[in-house]
Interface confidence: low
């Protein structure tokens, strides 16, 4: 049985819109259906309709189709807003250009190339012919419009009203000629809906034949209308998924506009001496990375191969070997001429407006009074007086207003990690400033004079869902997926937040990642009922040198018998030596027949000095690290466990005390593991959770 083609791709959708007929003579046909796809199939095939269907409306509330022999461009019709309606118009009737030979052209051009008016198809004057509308059903031989019913070489044509000229082609442009783009088409919002090889594009709001992550509702600013070619991911030019099950995606043939000017909205502020924001408009001539290694030329493939070439990124000024930011990275960067270092940031380029008064701080910087007013990611600080309400929300004392002048970096909340400021960016409400501690400063950043030893556990007991502990109490364990494969562990510390390691993100493209929760098996086998799959909406990098990342989920996890959060320790707390702890992960287990099940290894806390001795004095631990040794030789964290937690219990309460990060080897016998000490960063974590906006469930 032949598979019925899905024809909804042939329609232009206008959401929340219907058509009202002013002319009572116009016909309409209605019927109850389940989906807009069913309406489209019937409209395209004209099955059971007493007219040629040019458009339809799908009434979502009543689950009803309204088929029309007219569209929004017809006379006697007007558009009207309606929440429950979606209008779909057959593109062939509203398109003013042709695809290929123009066999599907159904527009209203009725003049030939040399300007002669066309003869109506139903008329035999002045030219007798056999192209009768009744003989060419579906070819729309209406009025005297140019058509190409047999798909002949020259494109749409007609018999002419001049007795001397029997027929002539019409001058209707190719859609690929009409459509044009600037740069690499990131701002292209045209109506090209087929690829360079002529394949029809798949609708962005459909998942067949190709499943994908570019959902219109997830990326409202990317222009994912109908099935038009777009460039949402910084490719050389617009592309689309295709309706051919064997061709996942293809580029579209859209030419560059003659006056290749960018829209004002697309132009980053150009600078040559310093960086504004993320430096996308930097056009200076710095050509080494931060440590002096020279940059590789953008038009060269040696020593590093890449596709960031001047041809592929036309408006990004990839000249010579100058530092640039063509892909929305944190700051300008380049490929390096060192074969062992692929890319590097040019962080030596100063930020614009950055004045270097006092460029280091002592202790935690609460007395810093310099005039730096930019965050580490280059965002300009916003005025303190505009943010006092937010500041009061997370500190419980009156800040010293005399210190909070202008928009300078300050530390009014006693943050352990130095001066910071609010930004004007709603996605990044605040961030640290790029100031270092003064050289030789030994002031401890954690000051606990009143309580020399703080307990890590809060007073509350271990949380139990519905009176039953979650399945083996590991509901907080997260599998971070990279291109559909497990890459790292993580801990769910709040419905919308996962604590993990910064090395777990080889690509900056968040579309490459997913978080799986509620699973026991790394492949999710047998976990279908309890598994939650969530997209990642933001990465918040921890304080400098922390190796931590807080990963924001696109929507909150639903806490149930299989998914739960794990508690954080008190800030600056100390856990007694020999406390029994566990590390969890789906990483390499050393077993030949690895079954993909979550593994646990039992460790015990070891003091930093003793830990250093076990590492033969080669490692000095600081206040941001915690050490735990294996009870059994050779058990402990390994690849694939990175980002996962070191979980300890105190006063019957389980907490994430450490995070597994790379660089310390895989469970080396007699070498205890060194973890990032979460207690040292607990205030930062709480501050992020409190101040960053998360989607509501």
């Amino acid at each position: 049985q032949r598979k019925r083609r899905n024809t909804i791709h042939e329609f232009k959708k206008s959401a929340k819109t219907t058509l009202i007929k002013i002319d009572p003579a116009l016909k309409i046909k209605t019927k109850k259906v389940n989906t807009a796809d069913q309406c489209a199939n019937r409209c395209t095939r004209n099955k059971g309709l007493p007219f040629t269907c040019k458009a339809f409306v799908f009434d979502k509330a009543r689950k009803q189709c309204l088929w029309f022999p007219f569209n929004s461009m017809s006379s006697g019709v007007k558009k009207e807003f309606g929440h429950e309606f979606d209008l779909y118009e057959n593109k062939d009737y509203i398109r003013n250009c042709i695809i290929g030979k123009g066999r599907s052209y159904k527009g209203t051009v009725s003049i030939t190339k040399s300007g002669i008016k066309c003869q109506p198809w139903s008329s035999m004057i002045p030219h007798e012919h056999s192209f009768l509308p009744s003989s060419y059903r579906g070819k729309d031989l209406q009025e005297n419009y140019c058509r190409n019913p047999r798909g002949e070489e020259g494109g749409p044509w007609c018999f002419t009203s001049n007795p001397e000229v029997r027929y002539e082609v019409c001058d209707i442009p190719q859609c690929s000629e009409v459509e044009c783009m600037t740069c690499n088409g990131e701002s292209y919002r045209g109506l090209m809906d087929h690829t360079e090889s002529g394949k029809i594009c798949q609708r962005w709001d459909h998942q067949t034949p190709h499943r994908h992550k570019f959902l219109p509702e997830r990326y409202p600013d990317k222009g994912f209308d109908d099935n038009y070619c777009r460039n949402p991911d910084g490719q050389p030019r617009p592309w689309c998924y295709t309706l051919d099950p064997h061709t996942r995606w293809e580029y579209c043939a859209i030419k560059t506009c003659a006056d290749n000017t960018m829209n004002d909205t697309d132009v980053p502020l150009e600078t040559t001496e310093c960086i504004q924001g993320q430096g996308e408009g930097y056009r200076g001539t710095v050509n080494t990375i931060w440590n002096g290694i020279p940059c590789q030329r953008w038009d060269s493939q040696y020593p590093h191969e890449h596709d960031m070439t001047p041809e592929n990124f036309k408006c990004k000024d990839l000249r010579e070997n100058y530092c640039r930011n063509p892909d929305g990275s944190e700051s300008p960067w380049c490929f390096t001429t060192d074969p062992n270092i692929r890319v590097g940031y040019c962080s030596q380029i100063p930020n614009c407006d950055m004045s270097h008064g006092q460029d280091c701080y002592r202790g935690n910087g609460k007395n810093y009074m310099g005039n730096l007013s930019q965050t580490r990611s280059g965002l300009t600080c916003s005025m303190w007086d505009k943010n006092m309400e937010d500041l009061h929300r997370h500190i419980f004392w009156e800040p010293d207003a005399s210190k909070l002048n202008e928009n300078y970096c300050r530390n009014p909340d006693d943050d352990a990690h130095g001066p910071w400021c609010y930004t004007g960016n709603p996605l990044i409400p605040w961030d640290y400033c790029p100031i270092s501690r003064c050289e030789g400063d030994t002031t401890p950043t954690i000051v606990n004079l009143d309580h020399p030893v703080i307990s890590c556990a809060k007073t509350k007991q271990l949380r139990v869902v519905n009176g039953i502990p979650t399945r083996t109490n590991i509901g907080w364990m997260v599998s971070l997926r990279y291109r559909n494969k497990h890459i790292c562990g993580g801990s769910l510390i709040k419905e919308s937040w996962v604590l993990t390691a910064r090395q777990c993100f080889p690509s900056r493209d968040l579309k490459d990642y997913e978080a799986w929760l509620g699973i026991h098996d790394v492949h999710g086998r047998g976990d279908e009922k309890c598994k939650q799959v969530l997209n990642v909406s933001q990465l918040v990098y921890g304080p400098e040198g922390s190796d931590l990342v807080l990963m924001k989920l696109a929507r909150p996890a639903v806490l149930d018998d299989f998914v739960s959060t794990i508690d954080l320790p008190n800030y600056g707390c100390t856990i007694p030596e020999k406390t029994s702890c566990s590390v969890y992960g789906w990483g390499y287990t050393g077993l030949i027949n690895y079954d993909g099940l979550l593994r646990v290894a039992h460790l015990y806390i070891m003091g930093n000095e003793k830990c250093s001795q076990h590492h033969r004095g080669k490692v000095t631990l600081n206040e941001s690290e915690i050490c735990a040794g294996a009870e059994k030789i050779g058990s402990g964290p390994c690849e694939g466990d990175y980002g996962g937690p070191l979980v300890c219990e105190q006063h019957k309460m389980r907490m994430v005390l450490g995070v597994i990060v790379p660089g310390r080897g895989c469970a080396i016998p007699n070498r205890p593991g060194i973890f990032v000490r979460v207690a040292y960063y607990a205030k930062w974590i709480h501050k992020i959770i409190l101040t960053y906006k998360v989607p509501q469930s």
């Epitope: 991911d233 590093h304 596709d307 592929n312 062992n340 890459i487």
Partner: antibody
Framework: SVEESGGRLVMPGTPLTLTCTVS????????ISWVRQAPEKGLEWIGV?????VTDYASWAQGRFTISKTSTTVDLKIPSPTTEDTATYFC?????????????WGPGTLVTVSS | DIVMTQTPSSVEAAVGGTVTIKCQAS??????LAWYQQKPGQRPKLLIY???TLASGVPSRFKGSGSGTQFTLTISDLECADAATYYC????????????????FGGGTEVVVK
Amino acid sequence: SVEESGGRLVMPGTPLTLTCTVSGFSLSSNAISWVRQAPEKGLEWIGVIYVIGVTDYASWAQGRFTISKTSTTVDLKIPSPTTEDTATYFCARVYDSGWNHFNLWGPGTLVTVSS
Amino acid sequence: DIVMTQTPSSVEAAVGGTVTIKCQASENIYRLLAWYQQKPGQRPKLLIYSASTLASGVPSRFKGSGSGTQFTLTISDLECADAATYYCQNYYYSSRSSYDTYNVFGGGTEVVVK
């Protein structure tokens, strides 16, 4: 250098592990790929293990092979070989940590699957 | 999956002559293509990467060209030692390719030197 070992004559269904031993460079800066070549046939890519320990496989190899690593070796496990798996197996150093060309190959190790 | 089609499967040429081998990718792989030489009973040897960059120690008689989907390996001033099978290899990874990964080699071209 890279060198493969573990190739031998095995019966169909008998699990087999091939090992690639590396020296002179670190697996924390280079990925390793496995490639095979059946007698009188072309090169066939099996899979890769990246620096961070994540693996990718050719679609036909998914489930038929497993790649894992230690600090100096990379293993290719064939849990249930069939006669079609008779081939010379090469391991190759990938130019850097991700997708790239293979700039160093081992001499290969021959696996014969026969009853 | 990206498919690499190599032509011809076999070619014969005289010493001192020139041989051209073509490799076509089923989608744009930019210049992310390498060529290898393999002699009977030996391991493959990297000749060219980035479509046209000569690997160290490879004579300049070997020349790679092309970008996008069409690539060519040209061997001029043929020597007897050039008798071997030549393979192209694609190493482009697109996040829009399906999550299945593909075989990265072309089918091979046997060069016979008379």
